[in-house]
């Protein structure tokens, strides 16, 4: 259901967490949202600028029977073969009723650095 | 709730520098880009710039590279705009505003007139 | 860089007449990403701050009266009052953010 412009209640239950590790580490970062009625498309961010090829897997789970019921939403960011070009902060983001939602940040970085 | 707030006014002299403050409350600073807008008396609206403040990475409208600097602080979660060797041309109302991805809600501070004069 | 043109650059009207504005882009908007036209509405009322009416080319900002349309694709783009009040009076500007941000030279709407 569209949410008005001031009530920013963000509909992100669990947000990407943290991965450091070697070059060449495989890893993945997951984002968590329920909301009411259709699942939107979750965009995955790095430092702010939307992932054009990002390598994400998304699945949706009825809380109910009925189509505008609750449903769980779950992206998963998976980070192959890890780079400095990969390090920075990432969000999930959605585009929901009249608002955009961000999720909290996590953060990738390289050991050693 | 979402809140840019801008000075009201600045009065410099010309050939100064001058820093224009927005501080931001009412979200998570460090995820969405702020942008810089300019507006002189009966003119249109331009683009200046943006700061992503969680990395401070920057985006310039090449007309103001030599004359604008975008900086943040994260700790009073603040923006900054500075201007070097200002001019009559740089008299004009500065606005910032929160980028929104392309979407909504969007959130304008009230702008600040900044006057260069003598 | 992106330019976009706006016209006309004033036009006065009564109120209850229909008024269309354009936009013109010099590239296409849309994201084949996020499947979003990236062209927003504004309106700017004298000594206020601009004020969002419609973004992604045709979506209504929550709380603008349903007088404003948006249309548009590809390059091209329209606004639309359908009954124009007294309270419309403002200057309306596009903008994109498809690259950054660029704004349209803007729209007066005068009130005869």
């Known amino acids: 259901a569209p949410r008005g412009t001031q009530a920013e209640e963000s509909p992100f239950v669990g947000n990407p967490g943290n991965i450091t590790g070697a070059r060449g580490l495989t890893g993945t970062l997951r984002c968590q949202l329920q909301v009411q009625g259709e699942p939107p498309e979750v965009h995955w961010l790095r430092d702010g600028q939307i992932l054009e090829l990002a390598d994400s897997t998304q699945t949706q789970v009825p809380l109910g029977e009925d189509e505008q019921d609750d449903w769980i939403v779950v992206s998963q960011l998976r980070i192959t073969s890890l780079q400095l070009s990969d390090t920075g902060q990432y969000q999930c983001l959605v585009f929901l009723g009249h608002q955009t939602f961000v999720s909290q940040p996590g953060y990738v970085g390289l050991e050693g650095l | 709730q979402v809140q840019l707030q801008q000075p009201g006014a600045e009065l410099v002299k010309p050939g100064a520098s001058v820093k224009l403050s927005c501080k931001a409350s009412?979200?998570?600073?460090?995820?969405?880009?702020i942008n810089w807008v300019k507006q002189r008396p009966g003119q249109g609206l331009e683009w200046i710039g943006n700061?992503?403040?969680?990395?401070?990475?920057?985006n310039y409208n090449e007309k103001f590279k030599s004359k604008a600097t975008l900086t943040v602080d994260k700790s009073s979660t603040t923006a900054y705009i500075q201007f070097s060797s200002l001019t009559s041309e740089d008299s004009a109302v500065y606005y910032c505003?929160?980028?929104?991805?392309?979407?909504?809600?969007?959130?304008w501070g009230q702008g600040t007139t900044l006057t260069v004069s003598s | 860089d992106i330019v976009m043109s706006q016209s006309p650059s004033s036009l006065a009207v009564s109120a209850g007449e229909k008024v269309t504005m354009s936009c013109k882009s010099s590239?296409?908007?849309?994201?084949?990403?996020?499947?979003?036209?990236?062209l927003a509405w504004y309106q700017q009322k004298p000594g206020q701050s601009p004020k969002l009416l419609i973004y992604?080319?045709?979506t209504r900002q929550s709380g603008v009266p349903d007088r404003f349309t948006g249309s548009g694709s590809g390059t091209d783009f329209t606004l639309t009052i359908s009954s124009v009040q007294a309270e419309d009076l403002a200057v309306y500007y596009c903008?994109?953010?498809?690259?950054?941000?660029?704004f349209g030279g803007g729209t007066k709407l005068e009130i005869k």
């Open positions: 903008k994109q953010s498809y690259n950054l941000w660029t």
């Open positions: 590239q296409s908007l849309l994201n084949s990403r996020t499947r979003k036209i990236y």
């Open positions: 009412g979200y998570t600073f460090t995820s969405y880009w």
């Open positions: 505003t929160r980028d929104t991805y392309g979407g909504s809600p969007d959130y």
């Open positions: 700061i992503y403040p969680d990395s401070s990475s920057t």
């Open positions: 992604w080319a045709s």
